[in-house]
């Protein structure tokens, strides 16, 4: 029930989760200098029942040097088998999170984890794409893939998301241009390191637009 | 508890505006797209458009295109839609509804959500009449 | 804009029964289908989301399958409150669109 593969890779794009289905298994990762605790567990696991799903296990790191210091981070990538990336950022609000039913949330940080979460993901899981900052997304279809399973294998979808600068034209037919960056504000900084899974409604081609007017607006 | 909470009934006559709003509550605000969509007496759901409240990007049904305006407050969670030029045709319970997204940048120029319209708001009677 | 036909307008059942819903949506939508519940005088309920999920706190005997164009909702045994009308919703292609509603009633 595992996914052979990763996520297919989008040029100028990023993917991410927004929840995990049962049977999803995250690695325990810590960042250079700190390793999995010996007692702890390689990964934590997406289990739920008919209600409720949690992660089963705590990843937990301890310094390299100091043995004894024990640290409630990320296990250590060298253990790692297939490394599954998410391509996300540890650091993401949980309150903006949805609770799915069969579904984990992503997990909170745990101190000095790997920068990167290596996921494991099981068929049926969805990730969902965003073009990276700098550039736009051609509206052509969902802009996320679905791990299914065809014919005995596992594949994913591919998603219909095409990103281009932003001095390239990249409108529906009859949307404007803004102006200027909304509310006059600086693009996120932490928006270039995450990836957040924007789930738009997609268009799978321009032409079904015709009598559809986009209108991007900033008060 | 998470909830969306809507302005009460309106009369109005033809050619006259009328502002609906929709106060959200119990959960992260930027992190919802909110769908306004009006259900006209015995007939079915009609969507008129979507606002990211995270810049108040929006976008338009073509039908109600020039007519409607959505804007949002942050600082109120409230968002609201203003309809102009009515005539008796827009008698309708008007809702807003909440969608997840993910683009939450102001510079964001995506405008992806999925899950469902999983919270509405009570609905908001506008009647226009002569 | 993707038109999407739900069938039959009105279904007549007694509890107990399966209801079978049908929405049939003019071009593809992959499994981009919700389905919604609204009963008189209420807002609609989401029920089903990506064609066969449930929604948080959703009972079992709603279910839901299709992918493409042809779209299904089954409640496999009707209980008094189930008796409402539902709406199928499409989010693959801007704009939104919804059907014209089934009502199941009471027969």
């Known amino acids: 029930e595992l996914c052979d593969d990763d996520p297919p890779k989008i040029t100028h794009a990023t993917f991410k989760a927004v929840a995990y289905k049962e049977g999803t298994m995250l690695n325990c990762e810590c960042k250079r200098g700190f390793r999995r605790i010996k007692s702890g567990s390689p990964y934590m696991l997406c289990t739920g029942n008919s209600s409720h799903s949690s992660w089963d296990n705590q990843c937990q790191c301890t310094s390299s040097a100091a043995r004894n210091t024990t640290k409630q981070v990320t296990p250590q990538p060298e253990e790692q088998k297939e490394r599954k990336t998410t391509e996300m950022q540890s650091q993401m609000q949980l309150a903006d999170q949805v609770s799915l039913p069969g579904h984990c949330r992503e997990p909170p940080p745990w101190e000095n984890e790997a920068t990167e979460r290596i996921y494991h993901f099981v068929v049926g899981q969805t990730v969902y794409y965003q073009c990276v900052q700098g550039y736009r997304a051609l509206h052509r279809g969902p802009a996320e893939s679905v791990c299914k399973m065809t014919h005995g294998k596992t594949r994913w979808t591919q998603p219909q998301l095409i990103c281009t600068g932003e001095t390239e034209p990249s409108q529906f037919p009859g949307e404007e241009e803004p102006q200027a960056s909304p509310d006059g504000l600086p693009e996120s900084e932490t928006s270039r390191l995450v990836t957040t899974t924007d789930f738009r409604i997609q268009t799978e081609v321009a032409a079904t637009m015709e009598t559809f007017i986009f209108t991007t607006e900033y008060q | 508890q998470v909830q969306l909470v809507q302005s009460g009934a309106e009369v109005k006559k033809p050619g006259a505006s009328v502002k609906v709003s929709c106060k959200a509550s119990?959960?992260?605000?930027?992190?919802?797209?909110i769908h306004w969509v009006r259900q006209a007496p015995g007939q079915g759901l009609e969507w008129l458009g979507i606002?990211?409240?995270?810049?108040?990007?929006?976008i338009y049904a073509q039908k109600f295109q020039g007519r409607v305006t959505m804007t949002r407050d942050t600082s109120t969670t409230t968002v609201d839609m203003e309809l102009s030029s009515l005539r008796s045709e827009d008698t309708a319970v008007y809702y807003c509804?909440?969608?997840?997204?993910?683009?939450?940048?102001?510079?964001?120029?995506?405008?992806?959500?999925?899950?469902?319209?999983?919270?509405w708001g009570q609905g908001s009677t506008v009647t226009v009449s002569s | 804009e993707i038109v999407l036909t739900q069938s039959p307008a009105t279904l007549s059942l007694s509890p107990g029964e399966r209801a079978t819903l049908s929405c049939r949506a003019s071009?593809?939508?992959?499994?981009?289908l919700a389905w919604y519940q609204q009963k008189p005088g209420q807002a609609p309920r989401l029920l089903i989301y990506?064609?066969?999920n449930r929604a948080t706190g959703i009972p079992a005997r709603f279910s839901g399958s299709g992918s493409g164009t042809d779209f299904t909702l089954t409640i496999s045994s009707l209980e008094p409150e189930d008796f409402a009308v539902y709406y199928c919703?499409?989010?693959?292609?801007?704009?939104?669109?919804f059907g014209q509603g089934t009502k199941v009633e009471i027969k």
């Open positions: 509804a909440r969608v997840p997204g993910y683009c939450k940048d102001t510079s964001c120029q995506d405008f992806y959500y999925y899950y469902g319209m999983d919270v």
């Open positions: 119990g959960y992260t605000f930027n992190s919802y797209y």
């Open positions: 606002i990211n409240p995270t810049g108040g990007r929006t």
């Open positions: 071009q593809s939508v992959s499994s981009y």
């Open positions: 990506d064609a066969s």
């Open positions: 919703q499409q989010r693959s292609n801007w704009p939104p669109t």
